[in-house]
């Protein structure tokens, strides 16, 4: 039986509103909550796309409006739709479109062919894409201030590009309770907003903000050391797209330095923690006298997964560790702001050459076995260590 | 898989001084010492030194202390010896191989160097 | 520094003969690590940590020994076996080699 209804349903997840004239808006299809694929064709009262209209249509993987009215795209229409990767608008009267109307979509194609596109530099993203190849975008016709059918680039004299961000920090080292200024300048055509991220820096600082486009101020208060390594990032944007730009507060504080017990990985190794801004300086002693590496007693850091934060982790690696190497083994850790020294006693192996005149003297009576081998004196684990 | 690269041969004159290259692929170039190692005509193995890429730490065997000079470019993975005055005694085949856990447990081809006027 | 002391300096075996090469530390050290190496070519790893085989190594070799002794068994000697084999100790600066063993097949 043939459909009368305004929508039709096309398969288990389609549907078709083809009936000229008879929608002015998207919102609340019935039955839309598993749509994946939306056709609208012949709607001129259709005219704005806003991102309450797509509102439960989390599904939708293919929208098509086509030979309808629609004049206006909101740039955040799609907000409700992350998984659309099919857009077609062509043939309607769209004179521009937001570079973040698809912002954040894994669009496969756009086709905009038959609108009534007006060339600058709102739409400098699209010939970028165009010109790229990027993602099937099918535009036909870009007007420039006027009909025409070919794409037309916009003139060698017009500068379309996104603001530019720099970020102002201080030139004098910063040290723990300091309270520190940063000013974000923008430059650009055409600004629209522009903003700090500092969802890094919970807890390191207190944050106060201030100022407006082109320039942003923030004062971070009372610092503390837990500011190191941490994003500071200032964005701005403008017709053309979005900046930002990422600073790091480097906070210094002393050194300090943490042992544990030697531990056998693949070899053996005296785990460290080291901390302090600037990155301490390290040194090694064996019973009190400098330490000398070499490639079988030697300083090996942990690749560290996290990278927000100053201290590192390590290894002092001794590869063929014998009784000689037995004793106490400190570790010094240095930076302008302080020192630290932390100590650990190592035992790998007995002397096998010590002799205790008190201890009884083993006689054997039987033949000494020719096949009998030695054992490693230091037994030692095959499994990869990390580092 | 690993492979430590030397150039074939250098030819130098006496008193003049010598750059061997040894060129790291198919591993973490800084997570491994280089050692150098040559070895004279009919001769046994000699130690000469070896760096850790990672922070630059050098040791020297004592007899070349003064003549030797080990370098590294991370950028491109390679390793340098310098040997300076050179005599007829220096012709050698001189051998880079690598260490992290156990010893030398991949060696270059070697780089042949004769000193003759 | 640390002598490593060969012996023999030269030796012969007939295919399946047992072979023993020995290496003497002049001072203690933890572990001994042997090389091959045939003419012309690069030394190759073969045996480290005193007794354990690198990879590829063929089980009829075996190390063995402590302190200031070690050495290098071979179970049953094969054509493949003749070469130069040296000993080396990672214990000391400057790191040393011994003279090497040369293993020729009778």
């Known amino acids: 039986a043939s459909c009368r209804e305004v929508c039709c349903p096309v398969g288990p997840s389609g549907l078709r509103c083809t009936r000229a004239g008879s929608l002015d808006t998207l919102r609340g299809l019935r039955g839309a909550g598993n749509l994946t694929e939306l056709y609208v064709e012949n709607q001129q009262h259709l005219q704005r796309l806003e991102f309450e209209d797509l509102q439960g249509l989390g599904e939708l993987r293919s929208l098509t409006i086509v030979k309808s009215g629609l004049r206006f795209v909101a740039p955040d229409a799609f907000r409700f739709t992350p998984r659309l990767s099919h857009l077609n608008l062509s043939s309607n009267a769209l004179e521009s479109l937001s570079w973040k109307t698809v912002q954040g979509l894994s669009l496969q194609d756009l086709t905009l062919s038959g609108n009534p596109l007006h060339c600058s530099c709102a739409l400098f993203w699209l010939q970028r894409w165009e010109q790229e190849g990027l993602c099937g975008v099918h535009t036909q016709t870009l007007h420039d201030s006027g009909p025409g059918d070919q794409f037309l680039p916009l003139g060698h004299n017009t500068s379309c590009g996104v603001p530019t961000v720099k970020i102002q920090m201080p030139n004098d080292s910063v040290e723990v309770g300091d309270d520190v200024f940063l000013q974000c300048q923008v430059e650009g055509l055409a600004l629209q907003q522009a903003d700090w991220i500092l969802t890094e820096l919970e807890g390191a600082a207190t944050v106060k903000k201030f100022g407006d486009l082109p320039s942003l101020g923030l004062i971070l208060v009372n610092v503390t050391s837990d500011l190191n390594k941490k994003n500071v990032t200032c964005w701005a944007e403008n017709d053309v797209g979005r900046a930002e730009v990422s600073v790091q507060v480097s906070v210094s504080f002393p050194a300090s330095v943490h042992l544990g017990l030697a531990v056998e990985q693949h070899h053996w190794c005296i785990p460290f923690s080291v901390d302090g801004q600037p990155a301490p300086s390290l040194r090694w002693l064996f019973n009190g006298s400098v330490l000398n590496e070499t490639s079988f007693i030697f300083t090996q850091f942990l690749e560290s997964a996290l990278t927000n934060e100053t201290m590192r982790h390590g290894c002092l690696r001794l590869n063929q560790p014998t009784h000689v190497n037995n004793g106490n083994y400190t570790l010094l850790a240095a930076n302008p702001y302080g020192q630290a020294a932390a100590s650990v006693m190592a035992a790998f192996m007995d002397n096998p050459f010590e002799f205790n005149p008190e201890d009884p003297i083993p006689v054997s009576f039987s033949p000494v076995d020719g096949n009998s081998t030695s054992r490693d004196p230091v037994e030692k684990k095959d499994e990869t260590p990390f580092g | 898989q690993v492979q430590l690269q030397q150039p074939g041969a250098e030819l130098v004159k006496p008193g003049a001084s010598v750059k061997l290259s040894c060129k790291s692929s198919g591993y973490t170039f800084t997570n491994y010492w280089m050692h150098w190692v040559r070895q004279r005509p009919g001769q046994g193995l000699e130690w000469i030194g070896e760096i850790y890429p990672n922070n630059g730490r050098v040791n020297y065997n004592e007899k070349f202390k003064n003549r030797a000079t080990l370098t590294v470019d991370i950028s491109s993975s390679t390793a340098y010896m310098q040997l300076s005055s050179l005599t007829s005694e220096d012709s050698a085949v001189y051998y880079c191989?690598?260490?992290?856990?156990?010893?030398?447990?991949?060696w270059g081809q070697g780089t042949s160097v004769t000193v003759s006027s | 520094q640390v002598v490593l002391t060969q012996s023999p300096a030269i030796m012969s075996a007939s295919p399946g003969e047992k072979v023993t090469m020995t290496c003497s530390a002049s001072?203690?050290?933890?572990?001994m690590h042997w090389y091959q190496q045939k003419s012309g070519t690069s030394p190759k790893r073969w045996i480290y940590?005193?007794?354990k085989l690198a990879s590829g190594v063929p089980t009829r070799f075996s190390g063995s020994g402590s302190g200031t002794s070690y050495s290098l068994t071979i179970s049953s000697m094969e054509a493949e076996d003749a070469a130069t084999y040296f000993c080396q100790q990672w214990s000391s600066i400057p790191l040393t080699f011994g003279s090497g063993t040369r293993l020729e097949i009778k």
């Open positions: 191989a690598r260490s992290r856990y156990d010893p030398m447990e991949d």
């Open positions: 001072s203690s050290v933890g572990y």
């Open positions: 940590d005193t007794s």
